[in-house]
């Protein structure tokens, strides 16, 4: 490449570095809807931000196609165990795409946290972290779901969160 | 700046992009001070390195402002459970900034790992992983704290660690 | 920008997008060999992909030297606890290099998940996540090992996976 080409390349590199899509959304009192929908998130206050990604009803919406490292952590807590077999918690990241009617599982964890209660304490705490690289097209969305979401413990946005960045 | 200045800036930016800030610090025998301070880390030996970030008394120090994916893992272990609710362990990443006198919580987990002891073995192991994107200004610092740090199990730098990279 | 500039920009964008190495490999029925070797992975179907990295017998193989964020999650599950201390599970990422005869531990976790069984359910689930930045030379390989791998629960590639990207 001649100098002009190098110049243009560098301009582009500068631009792409500045706008590398990234987001970190945080848990808030309104996160848990009880409606069977995905968790909702804070997008602006405190540690939350969106850069080159948008947000809609709990979903991170991709504006630029590419490979993204997506991640989520949820803080779980309870007192004793649900009676019966319902003590398994599923935490997952799911993709919504115009090409399919149903959400697609991307990254999922199952945990049985309430076995962490001890003889001297009924209270238990656990945390679930997910992260991985997925390809996302413009317009596709990623959401977080937790079943049973009643065991998600929100506080100040540092314990439950959801984010992504292009790699 | 004229074209020459811009050219130099871009050359520099390209170089700095090549040395995209990143670090991975590892647990060592000196990590646990018992002083109430943050964990300390190995910065050079083995898998540990600093590239475009510096280190001071347990803290990763930012030299270039931007969005960083910061992460930490700690290996926890013990024998049986302490009595009472003090069996909850808090593992967190905290920011120090010249603009505030107190550390700011960034990413935090609470776990109750000792409920993992079984009827046939009082020994338990657990691991806590945190990771997320935060904005950091030049001069700001990130530290790792674990309460109660006596339950952190160090060995060879692979089980407890702390790192970051610009996204 | 004139047409030439735009052309150069697109060339650059294409280049930079194509060559940042990244991969995400997913668990499959063939992942657990029982041979004492590392876990094997799906590289093409579903969510799995390789971009600027290659794969060989369970290993991600580096083609371009640099710092990589490597990660793995495994879904663990069982019924009750094995007797004795075999209830500890080790999940790790290991490096193979032509320079040493043995694998080198990079990132490792130990967990005691079966203590999560409860009074009303002997079934337990747990998840282990590892992620961190390591320097890898061209030709070096990274593998995932789980001891005891019989407790890894595969399903559809979303619960157990292995990936990397250059930072």
């Amino acid at each position: 490449d001649g100098p002009a080409g190098s110049w243009e390349q560098l301009i582009q590199e500068r631009r792409s570095h500045e706008v590398n899509p990234a987001a970190h959304l945080t848990g808030a009192n309104s996160s848990l809807t009880g409606s069977g929908g995905p968790l909702l998130w804070e997008t602006q206050l405190g540690l939350a931000f969106l850069r080159g990604l948008s947000y809609h009803d709990g979903a991170l919406v991709v504006t630029k196609a590419g490979y993204y490292y997506i991640y989520s952590k949820v803080q779980l807590g309870g007192v004793g165990c649900p009676l019966g077999l319902a003590s398994t918690i599923t935490h997952g990241l799911y993709k919504r795409t115009p090409r399919y009617p149903e959400e697609l599982e991307l990254l999922v964890s199952q945990q049985s946290p309430c076995g962490r209660a001890t003889s001297s304490s009924r209270v238990w705490w656990d945390s679930s972290f997910l992260g991985g690289v997925v390809h996302l097209e413009a317009g596709e969305e990623v959401v977080v779901r937790v079943l049973d979401e009643r065991l998600v413990r929100l506080r100040d946005g540092t314990r439950s969160y959801f984010g992504a960045f292009m790699v | 700046d004229g074209p020459a200045g811009s050219w130099e800036q871009l050359i520099q930016e390209r170089r700095s992009h090549e040395v995209n800030p990143a670090a991975h610090l590892t647990g060592a025998n000196s990590s646990l001070t018992g002083s109430g301070g943050p964990l300390l880390w190995e910065t050079q030996l083995g898998l540990a390195f600093l590239r475009g970030l510096s280190y001071h008394d347990g803290a990763l120090v930012v030299t270039k402002a931007g969005y960083y994916y910061i992460y930490s893992k700690v290996q926890l272990g013990g024998v049986g459970c302490p009595l009472g609710l003090a069996s909850t362990i808090t593992h967190g990443l905290y920011k120090r900034t010249p603009r505030y006198p107190e550390e700011l919580e960034l990413l935090v987990s609470q776990q109750s790992p000792c409920g993992r002891a079984t009827s046939s073995s009082r020994v338990w192991w657990d691991s806590s992983f945190l990771g997320g994107v935060v904005h950091l200004e030049a001069g700001e610092e990130v530290v790792v704290r674990v309460l109660d740090e006596r339950l952190v199990r160090l060995r060879d730098g692979t089980r407890s660690y702390f790192g970051a990279f610009m996204v | 920008d004139g047409p030439a500039g735009s052309w150069e920009q697109l060339i650059q964008e294409r280049r930079s997008h194509e060559v940042n190495p990244a991969a995400h490999l997913t668990g499959a029925n063939s992942s657990l060999t029982g041979s004492g070797g590392p876990l094997l992975w799906e590289t093409q179907l579903g969510l799995a992909f390789l971009r600027g990295l290659s794969y060989h017998d369970g290993a991600l193989v580096v083609t371009k030297a640099g710092y990589y964020y490597i990660y793995s999650k495994v879904q663990l599950g069982g019924v009750g606890c094995p007797l004795g201390l075999a209830s500890t599970i080790t999940h790790g990422l290991y490096k193979r290099t032509p320079r040493y005869p043995e694998e080198l531990e990079l990132l490792v976790s130990q967990q005691s998940p079966c203590g999560r069984a409860t009074s009303s359910s002997r079934v337990w689930w747990d998840s282990s996540f590892l992620g961190g930045v390591v320097h890898l030379e061209a030709g070096e390989e990274v593998v995932v090992r789980v001891l005891d791998e019989r407790l890894v629960r595969l399903r559809d590639g979303t619960r157990s996976y292995f990936g990397a990207f250059m930072v």
Partner: antibody, heavy 119, light 107 residues
Framework: QIQLLQSGPELEKPGETVKISCKAS????????MNWVKQAPGKGLKWMGW????????TYADDFKGRFAFSLETSASTAYLQINNLKNEDTATYFC????????????WGQGTSVTVSS | DIVLTQSPKFMSTSVGDRVSITCKAS??????VAWYQQKPGHSPKLLLY???TRHTGVPDRFTGSGSGTDFTLTISNVQSEDLADYFC?????????FGAGTKLELK
Amino acid sequence: QIQLLQSGPELEKPGETVKISCKASGYTFTNYGMNWVKQAPGKGLKWMGWINTYTGEPTYADDFKGRFAFSLETSASTAYLQINNLKNEDTATYFCARDNWDGKGMDYWGQGTSVTVSS
Amino acid sequence: DIVLTQSPKFMSTSVGDRVSITCKASQDVDTAVAWYQQKPGHSPKLLLYWASTRHTGVPDRFTGSGSGTDFTLTISNVQSEDLADYFCHQYGSYPLTFGAGTKLELK
């Protein structure tokens, strides 16, 4: 909606036995434990123990071991508290209260059953 | 057993006042504390759990704070219907225990 409906007031003599019922509705009975709480006249609340509605296993506080028994009729979504060999100090209002494992404490309470022990 | 010491035992207030009731635990109870309101002849009603989370339908003038051993229930802008007994309760360790109660009455 969620309701816990307790049986009516009881007037008993010392040495007799009383059995109080607590019928649950509006939720899956076997997914939540049931607590029993005593409140003597003009006094505070005292936890008696709880019963695991899934396994039927009772747990009693130290002061309520011996004469007190928790039981279930799962098909009728009903928990019972039986007090044997009644004493004057058993005079109180007894509440059943749902035990909520997601950390709400005792989130729903019965209206209480008054037991008076008098010769 | 974990003892919960509630204070004061009695509190006189006027409509519109702001009042605080404290509850001190003899051991660390994390945030596993609930607050109940009880009116004469009625069963206790859950106000707050996890020390600070309002139960469904509870007015936002009721707030809670604290963790570990020290907890506070605050009622801002007291209403006449708030006159009742208030109990703190720890549900983190067996045996479950209650504070002795605070009676909120009109001046």
